[in-house]
Every structure is written in structure tokens, then in C-alpha cells.
């Protein structure tokens, strides 16, 4: 099976690696621009230099290219609790992350929010907090896990999934109520 190629990939595949086909003359292969630069003018002829210019502040290219414009640097989303790990340079986009003792929850492939790692109060740490995953807690007896926090079995209602974990406590409460009736 031949993989489907877009027009640009088809044009590029005619030239050796690191070169691209001249948009106005398909007999000319021009050298691609280095990362950190962009295409200002195509090479005028075979063996002649491509006119590449350095990206301006606030923009970048992370790989060799023949882009007419550099890409805009990403901004870390403060409203999502993100912090800047490393700032944008001409050849690398901004790197955003979370603070210490926080993890990322991805809303989509390119949007994440920072949340505090669970401390496992009234329980023990089963798996430590990771970059993209909250701490996994195991609760002490008399507590059940709800939204990754250990909650007292006194807060367990019969309709919730905690009933199996809290069954002895629920039976005790029920027994106390029953014995109080005349």
C-alpha cells in the first residue's frame, strides 16, 4: 500500500533530504532553512542559496523548514494553573508545566490544567503523584475513596458504591437505630 501524500509532501519527495522543490520551477531543489529561521526567498537557481531569515522575537521554528512565517510562541495558560518551564527561543516553543506537587489533567491533547496532588489523608500512598496522574490512595479502615480522597464511612449512603467497603459501619449504624426503637 502506498501511503497518501499531500501535495507539499509529494513535491518535497522529488528532492533529496534537506531540500524542497522550488514552487515556480519543479526542476530546482532548494535547501531548506535551518530551525530558528524561515524562508524569505526561494533559491534563484540550482546550487544557489535559499534566503533564510532568523525568526523575530515571539516566534520560532523547531525544525528545518520552508515556512514563509515563523510560528507564534505558545503562552502558558495562567487560568489553568500553568507555569513557564522554559521560555520560547527562535528554535524552540515555550514549555509549560505545573508547579511542584501538582499534576496535569488533559482536557484535550493540547490543553491541560494543573491540579494539586492528593495527600492521602486518612489513607496511604499506593502510587506516587506523576506528571500526568494524581496520587493513587488506599484508605484506612472506616474510610472509603471518593474523588481520590479518603472520606469517613459515616458519609456513606446506601445508594453509593462505598456500601461494600463500609458495610460493617453501615450495619452498626443500622443496628443502633433498630435497637433504639420500641
Amino acid at each position: 500500500l502506498v501511503p497518501h501524500l499531500g501535495d507539499r509532501e509529494k513535491r518535497d519527495s522529488v528532492c533529496p533530504q534537506g531540500k524542497y522543490i522550488h514552487p515556480q520551477n519543479n526542476s530546482i531543489c532548494c535547501t531548506k532553512c535551518h530551525k530558528g529561521t524561515y524562508l524569505y526567498n526561494d533559491c534563484p537557481g540550482p546550487g544557489q542559496d535559499t534566503d533564510c531569515r532568523e525568526c523575530e522575537s515571539g516566534s520560532f521554528t523547531a525544525s528545518e523548514n520552508h515556512l514563509r512565517h515563523c510560528l507564534s510562541c505558545s503562552k502558558c495558560r495562567k487560568e489553568m494553573g500553568q507555569v513557564e518551564i522554559s521560555s520560547c527561543t527562535v528554535d524552540r516553543d515555550t514549555v509549560c508545566g505545573c508547579r511542584k506537587n501538582q499534576y496535569r489533567h488533559y482536557w484535550s491533547e493540547n490543553l491541560f490544567q494543573c491540579f494539586n496532588c492528593s495527600l492521602c489523608l486518612n489513607g496511604t500512598v499506593h502510587l506516587s503523584c506523576q506528571e500526568k496522574q494524581n496520587t493513587v490512595c488506599t484508605c484506612h479502615a472506616g474510610f472509603f475513596l471518593r474523588e481520590n480522597e479518603c472520606v469517613s464511612c459515616s458519609n456513606c449512603k446506601k445508594s453509593l458504591e462505598c456500601t461494600k467497603l463500609c458495610l460493617p459501619q453501615i450495619e452498626n449504624v443500622k443496628g443502633t437505630e433498630d435497637s433504639g426503637t420500641t
Epitope: H105, W107, S108, E109, N110, L111, Q113, F115, E147, N148
Partner: nanobody
Framework: EVQLLESGGGLVQPGGSLRLSCAAS????????MAWVRQAPGKGLEWVSF????????YYADSVKGRFTISRDNSKNTLYLQMNSLRAEDTAVYYC??????????????WGQGTLVTVSS
């Protein structure tokens, strides 16, 4: 076919409350993060609130924090937005949206038709 059907909008006085609902069908509801997005008259789209698949993670825009509560009932395939202490600036068309799971230019791949919330005395 994916469908998102909002309801619960209407006219309410400042300080009042409304509860919006979004009935989802045509996809496995529990597999997706969901969102409420609004568009005020003559303005752009604004993220209001997000909720994760299981409901453990939520996001609120600063403008609605402490007043709005997002929730979901996965057994009913329904998303909710409880809106309290409503203000005139909350007047907008409110859309229910499903997050896209692949990296695209858009965060959301499906939207409801919207429900109008008008806050006025």
C-alpha cells in the same frame, strides 16, 4: 450521530438562579470531557466550565467561579450547569460542547444548538 441538546435557558432577574441541562446521545458519554461555552451578544466565545469523564476534575472561568457549578450524570448521559447569583453580564447563548480527543485546531468537535440565558430586571 452525535447530538447535544441543551435546555433550561430563559429570562431571570439579577441574583436569580437557573439550571441548564444537556442531553447527550450518539457517543459513549463516559469517555469524554465535556464543557459549557457561552457567547454574549456581539462578543466572542468564552469558556465557562469543563468537567472530566468521571466528574473529578473541573474548570471554571474566573468570571463564574463560586457562582456556577458544573456536574454530570453519567447514568443519564446528561451534563448540567447550575447558575446562581446571576448577573446582567451572564446574558449569553450557552452551548454544551464535547471535547475532541485528537489534536485539532478546535478543542471541541461537537456543539449543541445553544440555549439563551437573559439576565434582566
Amino acid at each position: 450521530e452525535v447530538q447535544l441538546l441543551e435546555s433550561g435557558g430563559g429570562l431571570v432577574q439579577p441574583g436569580g438562579s437557573l439550571r441548564l441541562s444537556c442531553a447527550a446521545s450518539g457517543f459513549t458519554f463516559t469517555d469524554y470531557n465535556m464543557a459549557w461555552v457561552r457567547q454574549a451578544p456581539g462578543k466572542g466565545l468564552e469558556w465557562v466550565s469543563f468537567i472530566s469523564q468521571e466528574g473529578h476534575h473541573t474548570y471554571y472561568a474566573d468570571s463564574v467561579k463560586g457562582r456556577f457549578t458544573i456536574s454530570r450524570d453519567n447514568s443519564k448521559n446528561t451534563l448540567y450547569l447550575q447558575m446562581n447569583s446571576l448577573r446582567a453580564e451572564d446574558t449569553a447563548v450557552y452551548y454544551c460542547a464535547k471535547f475532541s480527543t485528537i489534536a485539532t485546531l478546535s478543542l471541541f468537535d461537537y456543539w449543541g444548538q445553544g440555549t439563551l440565558v437573559t439576565v434582566s430586571s
